[in-house]
Interface confidence: low
C-alpha cells in the first residue's frame, strides 16, 4: 500500500433530537483526493456496517440509519482516511452514542401578553426525520423541565431565571413596561442530557396591556 495514511485524529457525534451528525477532524496534509470512509456499529449487532465509502466533507448525517437510537442500546462509529488505494487505520468514537448524548432543544417559543403577564408556550421539536410515533414528549415522557431566562431591554445584565415543569409558563412583569426577551433551555430531570438555549424571543409590553382593578 505504500506510505500509510494517518488516521483522523478524533471522531465524535453531535446530536439533537433526530438530527445525528458524525464529525471528524481531517488528517494532516490531506490531498485533494483524500476522502473518508464511515462505518457504524449498533450495540447488540456486533458487526460494522459501511455507511459511506468516500465522503469528502468532515461530517456525515447518520440520522436516517440511527432512527432507532431512542429504542436501542446505542451506536459507535468509525472513520478512516482513504486516498486512492491507500487507507488509514480506523478512528472509533470514544464513547457510546446513545440517547444520553442527544442535546435537548425546543422547537420555538411563542409569547403573548395578558393583563401584565407574559404568557409563554414552548413548542417541542418536530423533526421531519422522526417516525410518527417518536415524538419528543413520548420519548421524554416524564420530568421535562425548562429554564427560562428573561431579559429586559435595555439592560443586558438585568434578567431573571426560573425553572418550569410545563410547556406553558407565565412571567409577572411587576408592572414594568418595555421590551422583554425570553430564552428557554430544556432539560429532563431524570436524565443527564445537555440542553441548548433557544433563540431569543422578544415582546413589547406597553401600558395598554394593563387593566385597572379597584
Amino acid at each position: 500500500h505504500g506510505t500509510e495514511l494517518p488516521s483522523p485524529p478524533s471522531v465524535w457525534f453531535e446530536a439533537e433530537f433526530f438530527h445525528h451528525i458524525l464529525h471528524w477532524t481531517p488528517i494532516p496534509n490531506q490531498s485533494e483526493s483524500t476522502c473518508y470512509e464511515v462505518a457504524l456499529l449498533r450495540y447488540g449487532i456486533e458487526s460494522w456496517n459501511s455507511i459511506s465509502n468516500c465522503s469528502q466533507t468532515l461530517s456525515y448525517d447518520l440520522t436516517a440509519v440511527t432512527l432507532d437510537l431512542y429504542h436501542s442500546n446505542g451506536y459507535r462509529a468509525r472513520v478512516r482516511a482513504v486516498d486512492g488505494s491507500r487507507h488509514s487505520n480506523w478512528t472509533v468514537t470514544n464513547t457510546r452514542f446513545s440517547v444520553d448524548e442527544v442535546t435537548l432543544t425546543v422547537g420555538s417559543v411563542n409569547l403573548e401578553i395578558h393583563n401584565g403577564f407574559i404568557l409563554g408556550k414552548i413548542q417541542l421539536p418536530r423533526p421531519k426525520m422522526a417516525p410518527a410515533n417518536d415524538t419528543y414528549e413520548s420519548i421524554f415522557s416524564h420530568f421535562r423541565e425548562y429554564e427560562i431566562a428573561i431579559r429586559k431591554v435595555p439592560g443586558n445584565f438585568t434578567f431573571t431565571h426560573k425553572k418550569v415543569k410545563h410547556e406553558n409558563f407565565s412571567l409577572l412583569t411587576s408592572g414594568e413596561v418595555g421590551e422583554f426577551c425570553v430564552q428557554v433551555k430544556p432539560s429532563v430531570a431524570s436524565r443527564s442530557n445537555k440542553g441548548m438555549w433557544s433563540k431569543e424571543e422578544c415582546i413589547s409590553l406597553t401600558r395598554q396591556y394593563f387593566t385597572v382593578t379597584n
Partner: nanobody, 126 residues
C-alpha cells in the same frame, strides 16, 4: 467531555486573600459563559462572578470591589482573586461553564450552567 477542576481553596483569616483557579479541558468553543458560584451550608447556591467570552464581567453585590474574575485563554484557566475576605464568604466555591449557542447574557443570576466542577472549600475565620 468538558471537565472543570477547581483548586486554591483553604482557610484564611478575615481580611486575608485567596486565589482560586479552575482548569478547563475538553472543549474548543470560542463562545462561553464561565463563572464562580458558591454554596454555604444550609443555603442555596449563588453566583459570585462571571465572565463572558468577550471579557465582560459581572459580580454579585456582596463581592464587588473585593473579588476579581479573570481568564487566561492560553492556559484555559479561570481565576477568582479574593481580597478582604469576610467570614460570610465561607462556602464551597464551584467553577461552572455554559458553552451553548444562543445563550442569554452572562450574569451572576445565571444558574443555567451545563458544566460544573466538584468545588473547593473556602473557610474564613474571624
Amino acid at each position: 467531555q468538558v471537565q472543570l477542576q477547581e483548586s486554591g481553596g483553604g482557610s484564611v483569616q478575615a481580611g486575608g486573600s485567596l486565589r482560586l483557579s479552575c482548569g478547563a479541558s475538553g472543549y474548543t468553543y470560542s463562545g462561553y459563559c464561565m463563572g464562580w458560584f458558591r454554596q454555604a451550608p444550609g443555603k442555596e447556591r449563588e453566583g459570585v462572578a462571571v465572565i463572558d467570552s468577550d471579557g465582560s464581567t459581572s459580580y454579585a453585590d456582596s463581592v464587588k470591589g473585593r473579588f476579581t474574575i479573570s481568564k487566561d485563554n492560553g492556559k484555559n484557566t479561570l481565576y477568582l482573586q479574593m481580597n478582604s475576605l469576610k467570614p460570610e464568604d465561607t462556602a464551597m466555591y464551584y467553577c461552572a461553564a455554559d458553552l451553548g449557542h444562543y445563550r442569554p447574557p452572562c450574569g451572576v443570576l445565571y444558574l443555567g450552567m451545563d458544566y460544573w466542577g466538584k468545588g473547593t472549600q473556602v473557610t474564613v475565620s474571624s
